[in-house]
C-alpha cells in the first residue's frame, strides 16, 4: 500500500441521507394523498377497505417517543417494500377502470423505489442490520372483479398513506438522535 492519501467526500453522508429520506417521504405522502383523493372522486369508497396481504400499521402516535433508529428503518423498509409490490401488482392486475390512473400509479411506484433505495443506503452507511424484505404473506392473485381491484386500490393507498404519515414523524424524530 502506498502512502496515506485522503479520499474526496462522496455525495452524501448518513445525516444528509436521513434528510433526503424525510423529503422523499413527505413528497410521497403528498402524492399518495392526492391519488387517494382522485380515487375517492372517481370511485367513491363504501366504507373502509383492507387487504390481508398488506402490512399492519407499524406505529401509533403513542409509541413514537420510544422509537429506536434500527427498528424504525428496518420496519419502514420492509413495509414500503410490501407496498411497492402491491402497487406493482395493482398496475398489472388493474382492469380498464383503473387504467386512467396508470401514470399516477407509475410515478408513485418510481418514487417508492427511490425512497427504498435511500433508506437502504442510510442503513448501509450506519451499518444497521438489514432484514431481507419478506414476500407478501398472502400471494397476490388477480382481483376477483373490476370492483375488487378498485377496493384493493383504496386499501393500498389508504394503508400507504398511514404508513408514510408515521414514517415522516418517525424519521424527523430520529434526526435528533443521529
Amino acid at each position: 500500500p502506498g502512502p496515506p492519501a485522503g479520499s474526496p467526500r462522496v455525495s452524501s453522508d448518513p445525516r444528509a441521507d436521513l434528510d433526503s429520506a424525510v423529503l422523499l417521504t413527505r413528497s410521497l405522502l403528498a402524492d399518495t394523498r392526492q391519488l387517494a383523493a382522485q380515487m375517492r372522486d372517481k370511485f367513491p369508497a363504501d366504507g373502509d377497505h383492507n387487504l390481508d396481504s398488506l402490512p399492519t400499521l407499524a406505529m401509533s402516535a403513542g409509541t413514537l417517543g420510544s422509537l429506536q433508529l434500527p427498528g424504525v428503518l428496518t420496519r419502514l423498509r420492509v413495509d414500503l417494500m410490501s407496498y411497492f409490490r402491491h402497487v406493482q401488482w395493482l398496475r398489472r392486475a388493474a382492469g380498464p377502470s383503473l387504467k386512467t390512473l396508470e401514470p399516477e400509479l407509475g410515478a408513485l411506484q418510481a418514487r417508492l423505489e427511490r425512497l427504498l433505495r435511500r433508506l437502504q443506503l442510510l442503513m448501509s452507511r450506519l451499518a444497521l442490520p438489514q432484514a431481507a424484505p419478506d414476500q407478501p404473506a398472502v400471494p397476490l392473485g388477480p382481483p376477483a372483479s373490476a370492483w375488487g381491484s378498485i377496493r384493493a386500490a383504496h386499501a393500498i393507498l389508504g394503508g400507504l398513506h398511514l404508513t408514510l404519515d408515521w414514517a415522516v414523524r418517525g424519521l424527523l424524530l430520529l434526526k435528533t438522535r443521529l
Epitope: S7, P70, R117, Q120, S124, L128, P129, A132, L178
Partner: antibody, heavy 114, light 111 residues
Framework: EVQLLESGGGLVQPGGSLRLSCAAS????????MHWVRQAPGKGLEWVAV????????YYADSVKGRFTISRDNSKNTLYLQMNSLRAEDTAVYYC???????WGQGTLVTVSS | QSVLTQPPSASGTPGQRVTISCSGS?????????VHWYQQLPGTAPKLLIY???ERPSGVPDRFSGSKSGTSASLAISGLRSEDEADYYC???????????FGGGTKLTVL
C-alpha cells in the same frame, strides 16, 4: 478531505495476536458504520467485520468469528480490530473502511508466518 | 468462491465501451439489495465508483455508469482510457452475513 489511517500490522507467528487501529478524520466518524476488509496477496477483497455507527451492532465473516473482535471509540475517532489465534490464511492487507463502504484507508499488512 | 460472480478479466481498446457483469442470487441482489462498484488501481486501496446501483460519487467521471436488473448488475465504462486499467469489484449487502459480500473482481486491461 477524508482520511483513514490504519496501523498495527506486522509479522506475527501462527497462534499469535495483533491489534489493528484506524484513525479517522475529515468526516463525522460517529455517524458511520465501520468495516474491516482484507485482501490476501494477489487475491480479491474479503469482508471481515462491521460495527454500527454507535457500536451496538457487530458482525463478522465466518472465517474470523470467535477469533477477531471489532470495536470503536467515537470520542477518539478510532476503529479497532483485535485479532487472536492468527493463522497463515489471515495474511493480508487489512483495510479500514467507512459507510457503504464509501471511504477506504490505505491498508496495513498483516503477515502470519513462523 | 465469491457469493457474487464476476468475469475474471475484461479488455478493450481506448475509446471503446466495456461492460462488467456481477451476478448474485435471490438472497442478495435479487432481494432488493443495492449494488456498489469499486475500482482498485494497481498498488492502491479500493475506491467507491458507483453506489446504490447507478449513483456516482462526486469526482467520478460520467463515463462510468451502473445498472441493476433482477439478480444481476453491471458496470459500463465508455470512452475507455489507459488509466482505467484496474481491478473492479462489485459488492452488495447479504442479510445472512449482516455485511457486504464482494465479487471475485474483474481485471480490466486496456489494449
Amino acid at each position: 478531505e477524508v482520511q483513514l489511517l490504519e496501523s498495527g500490522g506486522g509479522l506475527v507467528q501462527p497462534g499469535g495476536s495483533l491489534r489493528l487501529s484506524c484513525a479517522a478524520s475529515g468526516f463525522t466518524f460517529s455517524s458511520y458504520g465501520m468495516h474491516w476488509v482484507r485482501q490476501a496477496p494477489g487475491k480479491g477483497l474479503e469482508w471481515v467485520a462491521v460495527i454500527s455507527y454507535d457500536g451496538s451492532y457487530k458482525y463478522y465473516a465466518d472465517s474470523v468469528k470467535g477469533r477477531f473482535t471489532i470495536s470503536r471509540d467515537n470520542s477518539k475517532n478510532t476503529l479497532y480490530l483485535q485479532m487472536n489465534s492468527l493463522r497463515a490464511e489471515d495474511t493480508a492487507v487489512y483495510y479500514c473502511a467507512a459507510g457503504v463502504p464509501d471511504y477506504w484507508g490505505q491498508g496495513t499488512l498483516v503477515t502470519v508466518s513462523s | 468462491q465469491s457469493v457474487l460472480t464476476q468475469p475474471p478479466s475484461a479488455s478493450g481498446t481506448p475509446g471503446q465501451r466495456v461492460t462488467i457483469s456481477c451476478s448474485g442470487s435471490s438472497s442478495n441482489i435479487g432481494s432488493g439489495y443495492d449494488v456498489h462498484w469499486y475500482q482498485q488501481l494497481p498498488g492502491t486501496a479500493p475506491k467507491l465508483l458507483i453506489y446504490s446501483n447507478e449513483e456516482r460519487p462526486s469526482g467520478v467521471p460520467d463515463r462510468f455508469s451502473g445498472s441493476k436488473s433482477g439478480t444481476s448488475a453491471s458496470l459500463a465504462i465508455s470512452g475507455l482510457r489507459s488509466e482505467d486499467e484496474a481491478d473492479y469489484y462489485c459488492a452488495a449487502w447479504d442479510p445472512s452475513l449482516s455485511g457486504p459480500v464482494f465479487g471475485g473482481g474483474t481485471k480490466l486491461t486496456v489494449l
